[in-house]
């Protein structure tokens, strides 16, 4: 028995659908199939989950957060043994095992490795203005998503004649800041910032106004 | 001075997608400027579709989120509009457009695409 | 999305008279406004941006006023070549959203 190679890794962006391939080669008939697949949760290392179970000539359900979402792709009992799983969630982030016994047919390898990546898109970032507004100050605009897998990047343009930030503006794209030194009348305006990632993109928007002195009366 | 151009089939099959060209000439896409999909329904409606910013990313409206693509050719300086799953609904002029602040200061002159059977 | 509402939908008026169109938000965009004019089989021309901004090239008679959520163009003396229709937008961010748009014919 001879279970062939897996593509290594899969990325599936949360709630799609994923299919974890698993086939294999023997020399006996179907008839005493065992196959059981096995997830090492990313977030649990410690805490190996059944999957779905296939003996006997019966499915039987794993664990329960898998319920109602996980099947074989095709009839069983047959040489491929790649299951889906629906509406794929951040926890389902792991190491799948599928391990094949199919008596008297021993020997070889039996067991495939497949990693599952579940991807997650910026969710709507939060922007916020630290500092005064007044003239001639110096202003960080802060932007972060709570969630995001993987890690998404911000970046800050101002919603103007060209995208670009003023001149006077440093920003740091991991933390998600701008400074904007010795703001002025001309640093007024929207500011967007972007939080994107390998799956998807998100904004947020702040309206900076700059405070101009009040003239003083002289009396 | 800044020049854009929509190019594509005319004509569109239901659920088939929609593929359109914008050439944009006098200016490099990648210098500044976030580069548009608008299209005009035959009541004469305006609806922003998304664009791809100079510096690649892409922003859709939520209301075709799930059927949009949008991308570049840096190389030839053109961008373009991916329309999945299209129906009789799409039937519109379609025009490319540049803009800074979201107004839009540059459009092409726009080419009608007809979904039918 | 912030809903864009303009009025009148059509009106008509003669070669030197002054009208105004005016625009509403659903909800306060600042003066984040542009006005365009399109003319029939052609690609809509940037009138006015931050709601009072004239674009490049357009003649004064135009002008944009408002801010929050009411917003207005007036154009004055009225020359043939305004007859069209015009759209408002917010550019508030995304989705950008356009008005209905007004119809403006020669009496």
């Known amino acids: 028995l001879e279970v062939s190679e897996s593509p290594g890794s899969i990325q599936v962006a949360r709630g799609q659908p994923a299919v974890l391939p698993c086939t294999f080669t023997t020399s006996a008939a179907l008839i005493n199939l065992n196959v059981i697949w096995m997830v090492t949760p990313l977030s649990n290392a410690n805490q190996p989950e059944q999957v779905i179970l296939y003996q006997g000539g019966q499915m039987f359900d794993g664990a329960p957060r898998f319920h109602g979402r996980v099947g074989f792709t095709g009839t069983m009992p047959a040489t491929n043994v790649s299951i889906f799983i629906n509406n794929t969630q951040l926890s389902d982030t792991g190491t799948y095992q599928c391990l094949v016994n199919n008596l008297p047919d021993i020997g070889g390898r039996n067991i495939g490795v497949t990693g599952l990546t579940v991807l997650v898109p910026p969710s709507a970032p939060h922007c916020q203005i630290q500092g005064s507004q007044d003239i001639g100050s110096d202003v960080i605009l802060l932007c972060s998503s709570e969630e995001g897998i993987p890690r998404p990047t911000y970046l800050w343009e101002k919603l103007d004649n060209t995208l670009k930030l003023p001149p006077t503006a440093t920003q740091d794209q991991v933390q998600g800041t701008v400074t904007i030194r010795n703001i002025s009348a001309l640093s007024s305006g929207l500011y967007q910032c972007v939080a994107s990632n390998a799956i998807g993109t998100s904004t947020c928007l702040l309206d900076l106004q700059v405070i101009s002195p009040q003239p003083r009366n002289i009396g | 001075d800044v020049q854009l151009q929509e190019s594509g089939p005319g004509l569109v099959k239901p659920s088939q997608s929609l593929s359109l060209t914008c050439t944009v000439t006098?200016?490099?896409?990648?210098?500044?400027?976030?580069w548009n999909w608008i299209r005009q329904f035959p009541g004469n409606k305006l609806e922003w579709m998304g664009y791809?910013?100079?510096?690649?990313?892409?922003i859709y409206n939520p209301s075709l989120k799930s059927r949009i693509s949008i991308t570049r050719d840096t190389s030839k300086n053109h961008f373009f509009l991916q329309l999945n799953s299209v129906t009789t609904e799409d039937t519109a002029t379609y025009y490319c457009?540049?803009?800074?602040?979201?107004?839009?200061?540059?459009w092409g002159q726009g080419t009608l695409v007809t979904v039918s059977a | 999305d912030i809903q864009m509402t303009q009025s009148p939908a059509s009106l008509s008026a003669s070669v030197g008279e002054t009208v105004t169109i005016t625009c509403r938000a659903s909800?306060?965009?600042?003066?984040?406004l542009a006005w365009y004019q399109q003319k029939q089989g052609k690609s809509p021309q940037l009138l006015v941006y931050?709601?009072?901004t004239l674009a490049e090239g357009v003649p004064s008679r135009f002008s944009g006023s408002g801010s929050g959520t009411q917003f207005s163009l007036k154009i004055n003396s009225l020359q043939p070549e305004d007859f069209g229709s015009y759209y408002c937008q917010h550019h508030y961010g995304t989705p950008p959203t356009f008005g209905g748009g007004t119809k403006l014919e020669i009496k």
């Open positions: 931050n709601a009072k």
């Open positions: 006098g200016y490099s896409i990648t210098s500044d400027y976030a």
């Open positions: 791809i910013s100079y510096s690649g990313y892409a």
């Open positions: 909800e306060n965009i600042n003066s984040y």
């Open positions: 457009a540049r803009s800074g602040g979201s107004w839009f200061a540059y």
